[in-house]
Each structure stands twice: as C-alpha cells, then as structure tokens.
C-alpha cells in the first residue's frame, strides 16, 4: 500500500532508504534537456516474491531536441560523475551485499537521469536521515522515519533529528565503522 505523502522534511538534512519494499515506485525522471521516452512506464517498480525482488521496467531518457533519438540505459562515465559520490560508492558495493527478502536494492543510474530520485514509498518503509555537510546532528531519538498505516490512513513518523552548527555529516546505519557487519545493507540515497 502506497504511502499518501513524502517522508518529512528536516532542515539541512537528507534521507535515504537502505532497501526498498516491494510495491515501491521510482519515477523515471530525466535531467534538464531530456525527457522520458513516450513508450515506456513512467516509473520503475520493485516487484517479485519473498525469495527474489527486482526493479521492473527500465527508465530511458531521450533528448528534448531530438524526440526520436532514444538514449541507451547503460550510463556513460560522464553521466556517472554527475551522481553524488555517496550514491556512486553504493553502486560499487551492490555486488557484495546480501539481499533483504521482499526488498529491492538501489537501482543503478540510467543515462541522463535527473539528479534527484523521486520515490513513491509503501507502508512499512523506513528512511534514514543525516545532516548535510557542515551541519551537526542533535539526536533526541532515532534519526529515521517509518511509513505507518493508522485508521486507514498512512503517516510518516517524525524523525528525532535536528541539524545545527558546523561539523562533519552524521552517519547512516551500517556506515559508522569500516568493520561493520559484512551482511550490512548497501547505502542508497534520496536527496530532498
């Protein structure tokens, strides 16, 4: 069941999921000057069964100027560089990670993808927050938000995080130490 709205916004913070529940949609958004091809789903969908989940549909962007020229899905190095470093690092880690049943990992980038990924999350999804570079995290509790269903309506829990002052960014679960559990989930990012 889709969450009715987006996760809460925290000033000077971004959020991300470490894995995406089945039913999650990722909009096929393209960077400026490009648009989604006309014959293709408007989003990718995390789908599958309890033993294996994967992203259905592929996003493809085409130049706004040359409507009929379809770009390849495989990202080129120059497009890859446009993604945030943290996300690129997560992509390289994917092969070494263990999958979480009923969840999809961060999908790889597509050529001419927009810089921000727009997800439609489902009930039960957890997203994790961290302060952006230059802000320090003051925790009053978990720096996470969960989409919950109550009385037939969905709502996101409020993350207990305030970002203030000047310091290094706080860290997401599983990122604290290099010796973290080898079966920790890959990092994946959604900026807001």
């Amino acid at each position: 069941e889709l969450c009715d709205d987006d996760p809460p916004k925290i000033t000077h913070a971004t959020f991300k999921a470490v894995a995406y529940k089945e039913g999650t949609m990722l909009n096929c958004e393209c960077k400026r000057g490009f648009r989604r091809i006309k014959s293709g789903s408007p989003y990718m969908l995390c789908t599958g069964n309890s033993s294996h989940s994967s992203w259905d549909n592929q996003c493809q962007c085409t130049s706004s100027a040359a409507r009929n020229t379809t770009k390849q899905v495989t990202p080129q190095p120059e497009e890859q560089k446009e993604r945030k470093t943290t996300e690129m690092q997560s992509q390289m880690q994917l092969a070494d990670q263990v999958s979480l049943p009923g969840h999809c990992r961060e999908p790889p980038p597509w050529e001419n993808e927009a810089t921000e990924r727009i997800y439609h999350f489902v009930v039960g999804q957890t997203v994790y927050y961290q302060c952006v570079q230059g802000y320090r995290a003051l925790h009053r509790g978990p720096a996470e938000s969960v989409c919950k269903m109550t009385h037939g309506k969905t709502r996101w829990t409020q993350p207990q995080l305030i970002c203030t002052g000047e310091t290094e960014p706080s860290q997401f679960p599983g990122e604290e130490e290099p010796q973290a559990s080898p079966d920790g989930l890959p990092e994946s990012e959604t900026s807001r």
């Epitope: 889709l2 709205d5 987006d6 039913g23 949609m25 909009n27 400026r32 648009r35 006309k38 014959s39 293709g40 789903s41 408007p42 989003y43 969908l45 789908t47 259905d56 549909n57 706004s64 921000e116 727009i118 439609h120």
Partner: antibody, heavy 114, light 107 residues
Framework: DVQLQQSGAELVRPGTSVKMSCKAA????????IGWVKQRPGHGLEWIGD????????NYNEKFKGKATLTADTSSSTAYMQLSSLTSEGSAIYYC???????WGQGTLVTVSA | DTTVTQSQKFMSTSVGDRVSVTCKAS??????VAWYQQKPGQSPKALIY???YRYSGVPDRFTGSGSGTDFTLTISNVQSEDLAEYFC?????????FGGGTKLEMK
C-alpha cells in the same frame, strides 16, 4: 494530506476559451507530473495530457493538441489547463490528477452553450 | 494508440458475491495498468497500480491480476458500497488510455 483543488464550474459560449486551475497541496508540487482527464457521459475517460511543473515539460494526446494548453505556476503550486475554440463536445467534467494518478481533483464542469 | 477494452458494460452481483471485471489491451502493456472506482457524482478513486498493487486504504477484497494484454479486477465478498463503475487504464505508452468502464449493479 495530498489535495488537488480545482476551480469552479464554467458556462461558456461556443468558440470561446476557458482556463481552469488545479491547486496542489500536501506534497512537493515540482516533483510530480500533473495530468488532465476529460469525462463525458457515454464517452468514458480520456487522457488529455500532462505537465511536469519542475521542468515545464508537457505531453499531449494528439486529439487535444491545439485544443488544450497546459501550464503550471510553481510559486502557487497550481496547474492550469486552457481549452480553446470550444464546441458542444467540450462540455464535460475535467479532472486533474497527480502522483501517477493516485490523487484526483474534484473536477471542473464545463458547459458550452449558446 | 493502445486501445483498452472492457467488454462488459454492466455486471450484476449480490452482496457477498465474488465478481471479476476484465480488461484487454490491444498490445502488450506489461503490468502498466491501473484500476479506478467511480461512484455517481464523485471523482475516480485509484484502487490498483501496476496491475496488482493496492493503494493505501483500499480494502483487501479488491485484487488485481494479469500482465501483457489481459487484466482482471476481482472483488471478493462484494459489499453494497462497491456498487460503482470500474475503469482500467494503461500507462505503458502515450497517450494513456482508459477502458470504457464496467458498471457493477445489484441483482
């Protein structure tokens, strides 16, 4: 809560134009496409087109090209559709929809009559 | 354009029944199909996306299935509030197209 609030009913003369609005609330307006759908009794639902408020991109159903013009004002989180050179066939309820058709406005009734 | 056909304009049912509304696309649309419910004087309400996933707040008696060209919306244990018109829609390619609708009526 996500809400799409559409402008009120319109009574217009044949050959004239009408511009209706769809004000979005409860989500990031610039992140999601806004679509427009026409409904006439006995004709079901027809997709007119959509607009991405963040990039200004539009897609139109060929049938409505030159008839419908989609715009968006990000400062007020409002999408607009203008219909020109209206005939009796333009009499219908027009819905705006967003977030991959998950949310629909209440509809704007347009009546074209001399 | 992809044509979407709902061959049954009307279906009769009774409270507690199980009913299946069908929808056929003129070409392969994968699972890029949604189902909507519309009651008189109201806007369409989204029930199902991607052929089989329910939107939040939609009772689990509504089930979507199918892929390719043939799709089904099944309502098990029909309730009186389910009496409405049901539309399917393909969004696999532009222009997005809707089926003509199936009205669920009481026997």
């Amino acid at each position: 809560d996500v809400q799409l609030q559409q402008s009120g009913a319109e009574l217009v003369r044949p050959g004239t134009s009408v511009k209706m609005s769809c004000k979005a609330a409860g989500y990031t307006f610039t992140n999601y496409w806004i679509g427009w759908v026409k409904q006439r009794p006995g004709h079901g639902l027809e997709w007119i087109g959509d607009i991405h408020p963040g990039g200004g991109y539009t897609n139109y159903n060929e049938k409505f090209k030159g008839k419908a013009t989609l715009t968006a004002d990000t400062s007020s989180s409002t999408a607009y559709m203008q219909l020109s050179s209206l005939t009796s066939e333009g009499s219908a309820i027009y819905y705006c929809t967003s977030r991959n058709f998950a949310y629909w406005g209440q509809g704007t009734l347009v009546t074209v009559s001399a | 354009d992809t044509t979407v056909t709902q061959s049954q304009k009307f279906m009769s049912t009774s409270v507690g029944d199980r009913v299946s509304v069908t929808c056929k696309a003129s070409q392969n649309v994968g699972t890029n199909v949604a189902w909507y419910q519309q009651k008189p004087g109201q806007s369409p309400k989204a029930l199902i996306y991607s052929a089989s996933y329910r939107y939040s707040g939609v009772p689990d008696r509504f089930t979507g299935s199918g892929s390719g060209t043939d799709f089904t919306l099944t309502i098990s244990n029909v309730q009186s509030e389910d009496l409405a018109e049901y539309f399917c829609q393909q969004y696999n390619s532009y222009p997005y197209t809707f089926g003509g609708g199936t009205k669920l009526e009481m026997k």
